[in-house]
Amino acid sequence: SPQNPGCPNAEDKNFPRTVMVNLNIRNRNTNSKRASDYYNRSSSPWNLHRNEDPERYPSVIWEAKCRHLGCVDADGNVDYHMNSVPIQQEILVLRREPRHCTNSFRLEKMLVSVGCTCVTPIVRHVA
Amino acid sequence: SPQNPGCPNAEDKNFPRTVMVNLNIRNRNTNSKRASDYYNRSSSPWNLHRNEDPERYPSVIWEAKCRHLGCVDADGNVDYHMNSVPIQQEILVLRREPRHCTNSFRLEKMLVSVGCTCVTPIVRHVA
């Protein structure tokens, strides 16, 4: 239940558009079973690419790229009747406002690929 | 390349701990191929659960739960020699500071499951 039940939700129209944000992260050491434990052993394996941008917070984001078009079968062969596809997620990042060395940021949505999964394509035969 | 090459990175120790953030999101309508296109057709299908918290921004986050312990084979049967596992990602959210109806927030790390992938476990026999 909310700590402040009468407060406007940050997504409400009447909520202030500019807020103060403390950058000392809570839950800094979140115990994560890293997706990277899975990137090699998945039937839709992926590589991780570093996306760096000093004008963004966080400045480093890791992006997944599927290693194959198809999926790896039990014998280690790629089966092209299945597809390796990226699982994407929208995340929020802070983008520095363009005035010189300002402490002002703006929320920005980013679409990132987190890992890959193996899907059965819908097959259509063209007449 | 950075707009302001001489500016301290927001992750530097000497960067101010409190910054101003504009909540008018850039790239609000990011064109995303939703992971939800895949949640039913994956060999490691998942369901999406709504995680709502009015003290957080964004207040609604969707979490994936793998539908099976094993993975779905070409015939639609679950193969328990493989594992459906959640792909997790650390994301940043804004947590409202606990003073009544404040416009102050703090960055918080959250570990979210975005979707599932199918992995082959290494088998060990216990003596």
Partner: nanobody, 116 residues
Framework: EVQLVESGGGSVQAGDSLRLSCAAS????????FGWFRQTPGKEREFVAG????????EYANSVKGRFTISRDNAKNTVDLQMDSLKPEDTAVYYC?????????WGQGTQVTVSS
């Protein structure tokens, strides 16, 4: 290293009940799921039941659904399989399985014999 200790196997009559237990010790952290497979001579090991550690979600083979119940004790790292209304076709060696997502540990097995 991980150790698995299975107990509770034996011989019973059709319609009777039996309870299998499996305790994990050693470096059994980051458990994905815990459960049981079984094997009869000349056949492949088949999945019986499993319980996911994070949320206690359970899954059963169709052949045992409604008769077998899997449960866990998080604090003790144990999993139990309550087997009711046993049938002769449930006769097999039952193997405890501890799954850590990318590594899976198999116990040595315990014999269950159901006679008609």
């Amino acid at each position: 290293e991980v150790q698995l200790v299975e107990s509770g196997g034996g011989s019973v009559q059709a319609g009777d009940s039996l309870r299998l237990s499996c305790a994990a010790s050693g470096r059994a952290n980051s458990i994905n799921w815990f459960g049981w497979f079984r094997q009869t001579p000349g056949k492949e090991r088949e999945f019986v039941a499993g319980i996911r550690w994070s949320d206690a979600y359970t899954e059963y083979a169709n052949s045992v659904k409604g008769r077998f119940t899997i449960s866990r004790d998080n604090a003790k790292n144990t999993v139990d399989l309550q087997m009711d209304s046993l049938k002769p076709e449930d006769t097999a060696v039952y193997y405890c399985v501890l799954d850590l997502s990318t590594v899976r540990y198999w116990g040595q097995g315990t014999q269950v014999t159901v006679s008609s």
